[in-house]
Structure formats: structure tokens, C-alpha cells
């Protein structure tokens, strides 16, 4: 799997899309997990509804939401109020039994806010009470890592 890079601006919302073969993954729940190190486990962040016929419904865990278009074959993850600590490697997964197939490997990069909301107290920032529907979603910038690029840079 190549790694696809999605860039979002700090404090804004980032939408990550993971296309998949809807027939190959028919009847399977999906998940979004965070990769802990190059060979470490992928820690589940959020998964789609336990009932596959309700996969369309948005499920949330904190500031992360997931929804699955099972007919179109697109899993969508929204990271709201993006923070520097959200940067890192993730996976979209298709679940079957205790196994998980990787649909897409994702690198989330968090860019500094050019307006720097921290110094602008009168600017609106989505509150915890705001719904995902109301939060403004930036069109994410995405690209695949070039061949030879190292997804997990060696640690010194």
C-alpha cells in the first residue's frame, strides 16, 4: 500500500476519504486506526455502526467521525478542530471477524493556521457543542508518498 498524505490547517476540519471496492468489502464494517510506530499496532480510533445496514450513519469518538457509503464504496473520516498532535500515520480498515484489511494508509499533516486563531480572540472556533455537520470542512490536500520516500523516518 502507498501512503496518501492529507494536509489540513490547525483548528479547522480535515476530511479523509478512503475509496474501496464495494463488492469485495460488501457486508464488512470499517474502522479508522492510528499507527503506533512502524511495526507497532494500529490503535482503533472509531469504527462504523455495529449494524452494517446503518453504516451510513455518522459515528463519533471525540473530535473524529466516520461514515461509510457502502454502495459507492467510500469511507469518509472527519477530523474536527485539527491539532498538531493529530499529525501522524493512520489506516482505513475493512473488518471481517477478528481480521482487518487495510483499505488505505494515510499520513495526516497539520499545517499552521495562517490566521493564527490563538491571537484572534474574536474569531469563531467550532465549540464542542457544534455538530460535525456545522463545522466547516476544508478540502484536504492529498498526495501519495513518492517511491523511495520513507513513511516512518528512522528515529535517532
Amino acid at each position: 500500500h502507498n501512503t496518501t498524505v492529507f494536509q489540513g490547517v490547525e483548528g479547522q476540519s480535515l476530511q479523509v476519504s478512503c475509496p474501496y471496492d464495494s463488492m469485495k468489502h460488501w457486508g464488512r464494517r470499517k474502522a479508522w486506526c492510528r499507527q503506533l510506530g512502524e511495526k507497532g499496532p494500529c490503535q482503533r480510533v472509531v469504527s462504523t455502526h455495529n449494524l452494517w445496514l446503518l453504516s451510513f450513519l455518522r459515528r463519533r469518538n471525540g473530535s473524529t467521525a466516520i461514515t461509510d457509503d457502502t454502495l459507492g464504496g467510500t469511507l469518509t473520516i472527519t477530523l474536527r478542530n485539527l491539532q498538531p498532535h493529530d499529525a501522524g500515520f493512520y489506516q482505513c480498515q475493512s473488518l471481517h471477524g477478528s481480521e482487518a484489511d487495510t483499505l488505505r494508509k494515510v499520513l495526516v499533516e497539520v499545517l499552521a493556521d495562517p490566521l493564527d486563531h490563538r491571537d484572534a480572540g474574536d474569531l469563531w472556533v467550532p465549540g464542542e457543542s457544534e455538530s460535525f455537520e456545522d463545522a466547516h470542512v476544508e478540502h484536504s490536500i492529498s498526495r501519495s508518498l513518492l517511491e523511495g520516500e520513507i513513511p516512518f523516518p528512522p528515529t535517532s
Epitope: G27, L51, W52, L53, F56, L57, E133
Partner: antibody, heavy 128, light 107 residues
């Protein structure tokens, strides 16, 4: 408007199979934007969701854990209806059985799922 | 399964009264909650979906609120046709469950 019409016997003997049918008018059992449910109601257990079926390129069933080993919900596309079969019934299965359409809310988008159209209900008594 | 507990189990009220029914989930269900009205011998009728959204054709005197574990159905001014039993229902869990019902009777 959408209507659901139920049919089936009101008396079933213990250990036998309960069979009910729900005929749909004004919608299609093959709709990809709905699920077709069976729900029952009894004084002892209240309202209880039993399971649903939906067409998403192929047919897909999901059942409540409490009845999973005994239940089958099937579509009949030629008659635009769906059916419930509950095997090995006991007096505890005595209830009013309802079919219902499950729909997704459009506002707020991707947030709601609800039973908006119900059949008239069928009282099924399990007794010898 | 997620348990849904309604309170009170029954209440007596007069026409014009403001009536509040509560529903508590045994674990957090976000806004995955619907409210239904049922009259004797009839099927339940959808009133509110996704905790606070009024179903089309339902009078505006009905409203819903809440999120997480605690939810409320309010009838702002009770009408004669509102005397019925009301049920909440969650759809977070793989076995969708209903509350035991609240019967609203004439005082």
C-alpha cells in the same frame, strides 16, 4: 403514501414456526435507502426489535442477539413484500408483531435512523 | 444491550399542561434516540428522530432534547389527542432497544 399490510396466522403451536408476511405499497422492498424491520410487543418484554433486511447490491440481514438462532427475514421481490419466520416458538413468543420501514434522516444528514411506517400489527399467540 | 429507562412510568395531566418525559440510556448513545407515541390497539407513531428532529406532520408542540445518556420529550400544551403511551428508542447498539413506556392519562 407508503403502507404496510401484514398477514399470517394468529395462533401457533409450541415448537412450531411462526410465519408472517408484510406487503409493501408505495415503496420498494429493493430500495437501497430503506431497511425492512420486524418488531414485536408484549406486556412482559415491551417493544423488541427482532431484525431487518435491506438491499445494498445484494440482500443483507441483521438480527437481534436474543433471537439470532431462530429468526429468518426474507424478501419477495415479485410480490414486493418481506416475511418473518421464527422457529421453535414458546409461549414467551406470544406478542403483537409489527413490520416497519427503517429510514435515514436527511436533516441532520447521516444522523437519524427511525421507524416511520408501521404495519397494523398481528397478535400471535403461542399455545397448544 | 443498552437499557433504556423512562420516567415516570405514568403521569396524570390536564389539557393545556406542559408535560415532560425523560429517558435515560445505560451508556452514552450520542443523539441516537427516537420518540414514538402509541394509542391502544394501534402501532407506534414516530414523533421525534435523532433526539431533537420533529418528524414531518407532527405538531410543533412536541419537542425533544438531550444527548449522551439523558433525553427529554416535551409536550408544550397537552391536547386531548395526546393522551397515549410514549416510548424512546436507541439505535446506537446492534440490538436496538426501546424504553418501557410512559403512559399519559387524563387527570
Amino acid at each position: 403514501q407508503v403502507q404496510l399490510q401484514q398477514s399470517g396466522p394468529g395462533l401457533v403451536k409450541p415448537s412450531q414456526t411462526l410465519s408472517l408476511t408484510c406487503a409493501i405499497s408505495g415503496d420498494s422492498v429493493s430500495s437501497s435507502s430503506a431497511a425492512w424491520n420486524w418488531i414485536r410487543q408484549s406486556p412482559s418484554r415491551g417493544l423488541e426489535w427482532l431484525g431487518h433486511i435491506g438491499y445494498r447490491s445484494k440482500w443483507y440481514n441483521e438480527y437481534a442477539v436474543s433471537v439470532k438462532s431462530r429468526i429468518t427475514i426474507n424478501p419477495d421481490t415479485s410480490k414486493n413484500q418481506f416475511s418473518l419466520q421464527l422457529n421453535s416458538v414458546t409461549p414467551e413468543d406470544t406478542a403483537v408483531y409489527y413490520c416497519a420501514r427503517g429510514m435515514y434522516g436527511s436533516v441532520p444528514y447521516k444522523e437519524g435512523y427511525y421507524f416511520d411506517i408501521w404495519g397494523q400489527g398481528t397478535l400471535v399467540t403461542v399455545s397448544s | 444491550d443498552i437499557q433504556m429507562t423512562q420516567s415516570p412510568s405514568s403521569l396524570s395531566a390536564s389539557v393545556g399542561d406542559r408535560v415532560t418525559i425523560t429517558c435515560r440510556a445505560s451508556q452514552g448513545i450520542s443523539s441516537d434516540l427516537n420518540w414514538y407515541q402509541q394509542k391502544p390497539g394501534k402501532a407506534p407513531k414516530l414523533l421525534i428522530y435523532a433526539a431533537s428532529n420533529l418528524q414531518s406532520g407532527v405538531p410543533s408542540r412536541f419537542s425533544g432534547s438531550g444527548s449522551g445518556t439523558d433525553f427529554t420529550l416535551t409536550i408544550s400544551s397537552l391536547q386531548p389527542e395526546d393522551f397515549a403511551t410514549y416510548y424512546c428508542q436507541q439505535y446506537t447498539d446492534e440490538s436496538m432497544t426501546f424504553g418501557q413506556g410512559t403512559k399519559v392519562e387524563i387527570k
